[in-house]
Amino acid sequence: LQDPCSNCPAGTFCDNNRNQICSPCPPNSFSSAGGQRTCDICRQCKGVFRTRKECSSTSNAECDCTPGFHCLGAGCSMCEQDCKQGQELTKKGCKDCCFGTFNDQKRGICRPWTNCSLDGKSVLVNGTKERDVVCGPSPADLSPGASSVTPPAPAREPGHSPQ
């Protein structure tokens, strides 16, 4: 015998209290698959979360973060504060990238500048807190008399930015 509930489409539930009739999901609830015996409560985007997509009878609401924050985790389960470019978020808040490192985003950690010499290249543009170095041609490729920017000093251990 076929389960009568299997005929209930997404957006409905199989109502045991009404002889297993397919009933629409109540307000603020949804079922994303057929044959459900209950509907799930819609996610509410509250506090620092804002609604990116409204809940419907067949799909849950989706949240993102208010400006100044970005999503972390599956389905934006957490909002993390943004920093400025050239900074990283530490346990003590946003701190400038230390010398020899950079961050070109409002999130994530400061990463060491590219070491151009490892690829046999010279530094064309020095790095900053916000931007990586730009590597140029190898010193041997430069025409006689041409000079390149001095390669950066080795990066200090990350995580110790000057106060």
Partner: nanobody, 122 residues
Amino acid sequence: QVQLQESGGGLVQPGGSLRLSCAASGFSLGLYAIGWFRQAPGKEREWVSCIMSSDSSAYYADSVKGRFTVSRDNAKNTVYLQMNRLKPEDTAVYYCAAPQSDCFHYSENDYWGQGTQVTVSS
């Protein structure tokens, strides 16, 4: 019942001061960082300030730095936001929140107050 309640809002002239309070009931505020947010009509909710639970380190948005001061009195289970040199653009509903982790991470399980209206106008 776990609850956060803001108070102290009102109408104030530009250049004036207000002190907002965020009182907790049903849990110990001293165990939590407390963040302050505000939302002006038709605008997104904006982070204003936060005070850590561990060492009472304070953090401020650039827009309020030097004018607002956050402090806490764990014995009274209350956090305060002292707002000086108020400007018309500070007009908003002010909310306090108790994130589960720290000043910089907020989840859907955090405690939030209902808000208190601050209006700066002459």
